[in-house]
């Protein structure tokens, strides 16, 4: 008995071939011997089966001795043994129809779980293997679960159902709703304007929800809400904003915030949350601000950084075009009695400069100039 696998919603073509290459009489029946379709001369006739409006054949092939049964918009319950009667012979074809669906919406928030459920006909024992867009393989039976979805899981999932050494492939498009970056860090000199951007990693027709930026300053004992906003069809409107600092927010996507001045008291880390309409859970992006200050007080030239820096970072003070006078893995370094000239304060990671601030040291009878 020939086995054919079909996909729910698809069209399948079951073949039946006669030895004579001409149009002769044939019938297709199901396992209950109910006629599905056949021919009467050159006319297609249909029986009383439940496939009536979904069954068809290809009359153009009859003259070649081919009498296929075409079933459109397959349903799981179409799984059956189909019998083709032609030339006093019976050809049996077992059709097994499978369906694979995502448990809920195919638009899921980062960190949520994806469950794929296999619909299969009674008596079948299929195995399923799915490959995610990033190449990760998961195997299972009737259900497959992937917890903690990541941004790289967005895209087409390819699932192969195996039964009776035959396979059928399903493709499911999954959209993981997330920010492009889970975390970002902004390095600024004191007094500079700060731009925070929160680009989304997905595009949808309409985007509605609400968001908030909570900020934990390094110098503060507790976090506070800096801004709350609404999102309606990709348009941003501010609901509430603190007076210090007075953030400004762009009116269109991507979400964009401007802090007028980088100051040591603002250095720290923030968490932007975005709750989307009709979705449970929230999108999160962490943002960090590191602020640098170079100062000269009497005979002491000091460079300091505030904010969440890595212990790998090196802070250096150097006279322009010279080797570093002091270079330490600290958040503050200083030079006593610095010689006159343009001094550079550098925050670097493996020699890659992340932040630089210049301060001009004048001869001892003058006061310093900050460019």
């Amino acid at each position: 008995k020939k086995v054919v696998l079909g996909k729910k919603g698809d069209t399948v073509e079951l073949t039946c071939t006669a030895s004579q290459k001409k149009s002769i009489q044939f019938h297709w029946k199901n396992s209950n011997q109910i006629k599905i379709l056949g021919n009467q001369g050159s006319f297609l006739t249909k029986g009383p089966s439940k496939l009536n409006d979904r069954a068809d054949s290809r009359r153009s092939l009859w003259d070649q001795g081919n009498f296929p049964l075409i079933i459109k918009n397959l349903k799981i319950e179409d799984s059956d043994t189909y019998i083709c009667e032609v030339e006093d012979q019976k050809e049996e074809v077992q059709l097994l129809v499978f369906g694979l669906t995502a448990n809920s919406d195919t638009h899921l928030l980062q960190g949520q779980s994806l469950t794929l459920t296999l619909e299969s006909p009674p008596g079948s024992s299929p195995s399923v293997q799915c490959r995610s867009p990033r190449g990760k393989n998961i195997q299972g039976g009737k259900t497959l679960s992937v917890s903690q979805l990541e941004l790289q899981d967005s895209g087409t999932w390819t699932c192969t159902v195996l039964q009776n050494q035959k396979k059928v492939e399903f493709k499911i498009d999954i959209v993981v709703l997330a920010f492009q970056k889970a975390s970002s860090i902004v390095y600024k000199k004191e007094g500079e304007q700060v731009e925070f951007s929160f680009p989304l990693a997905f595009t949808v027709e309409k985007l509605t929800g609400s968001g908030e930026l909570w900020w934990q300053a390094e110098r503060a004992s507790s976090s506070k809400s800096w801004i709350t906003f609404d999102l309606k069809n990709k348009e941003v409107s501010v609901k509430r904003v603190t007076q210090d600092p007075k953030l400004q927010m762009g009116k269109k996507l991507p979400l964009h915030l401007t802090l007028p001045q980088a100051l040591p008291q603002y250095a720290g880390s923030g968490n932007l949350t975005l709750a989307l309409e009709a979705k449970t859970g929230k999108l999160h992006q962490e943002v960090n601000l590191v602020v640098m200050r170079a100062t000269q007080l009497q005979k002491n030239l000091t460079c300091e950084v505030w904010g969440p820096t890595s212990p790998k970072l090196m802070l250096s003070l150097k006279l322009e075009n010279k080797e570093a006078k002091v270079s330490k893995r600290e958040k503050a370094v200083w030079v006593l009695n610095p010689e006159a000239g343009m001094w550079q304060c550098l925050l670097s990671d493996s020699g890659q400069v992340l932040l630089e601030s210049n301060i001009k040291v004048l001869p001892t009878w003058s006061t310093p100039v900050q460019p």
């Epitope: 790998k312 090196m314 330490k328 893995r329 600290e330 958040k331 493996s350 890659q352």
Partner: antibody, heavy 118, light 113 residues
């Protein structure tokens, strides 16, 4: 497998220059600082300086200032250390080493023996 | 520059016994900003480049046997080999990477008694 492969041994006359290469394989060289460390026969380890192959930034130990130059060729994932005005006390094995994600030198080249002799 | 001084210069220990090497820095190599000790230990065998054993004073590099351990903070550090094996015969160096120039101890030669 991540490794740093250095050029072969060199014999130089006093006053000459030597250029030692260090090629990275199995790792993108630009993500890490590369330091150069030398070891005179039977002696300890001496740090000469570092280079960030991505930015081209360098930092040299005061002792070698003016005599050492570190350069890179990102297309071949190679860094170079050139030492000029060689003297007999520069006879040593020269190592390149990668400053790992946690700052210490986690991968070393096999070493290049430089002999300075008249 | 920070000067690193190791003691002893050489050490002979019986197989299976404990070996202890000390390292003292001329100034603290502990960062008050990050609460980290920027000290590493290396092992060097003849004709080979040094091999990283310990970083941040006490964190073992992956693949290093757990008989090697590091301790200490500020200016005083110790490398301990709990049960000496024949393959541990080498020269051991401490290194500070708290500030540049990076400096090494003079080395301690470990032999079997």
């Amino acid at each position: 497998q991540v490794q740093l492969v250095q050029s072969g041994a060199e014999v130089k006359k006093p006053g000459a220059s030597v250029k030692v290469s260090c090629k990275a394989s199995g790792v993108t060289i630009s993500n890490y600082a590369i330091s150069w460390v030398r070891q005179a026969p039977g002696q300890g380890l001496e740090w000469m300086g570092w280079m960030n192959p991505n930015s081209g930034n360098t930092g040299y130990a005061q002792k070698f200032q003016g005599r050492v130059t570190m350069t890179r060729d990102t297309s071949t994932s190679t860094v170079y250390m050139e030492l000029s005005s060689l003297r007999s006390e520069d006879t040593a094995v020269y190592y390149c080493a990668r400053e790992g994600l946690l700052d210490a030198f986690d991968i070393w080249g096999q070493g290049t023996m430089v002999t300075v002799s008249s | 520059d920070i000067v690193m001084t190791q003691s002893p210069d050489s050490l002979a220990v019986s197989l299976g016994e404990r070996a202890t090497i000390n390292c003292k820095s001329s100034q603290s190599v502990s960062s008050s900003s990050y609460n980290k000790n920027y000290l590493a230990w290396y092992q060097q065998k003849p004709g080979q480049p040094p091999k990283l054993l310990i970083y941040w004073a006490s964190v073992r590099e992956s693949g290093v046997p757990d008989r090697f351990s590091g301790s200490g903070s500020g200016t005083d550090f110790t490398l301990t080999i709990s049960s000496l094996q024949a393959e541990d015969v080498a020269v051991y160096y401490c290194q500070q990477y708290y500030s540049t120039p990076i400096t090494f101890g003079q080395g301690t030669r470990l032999e079997i008694k």
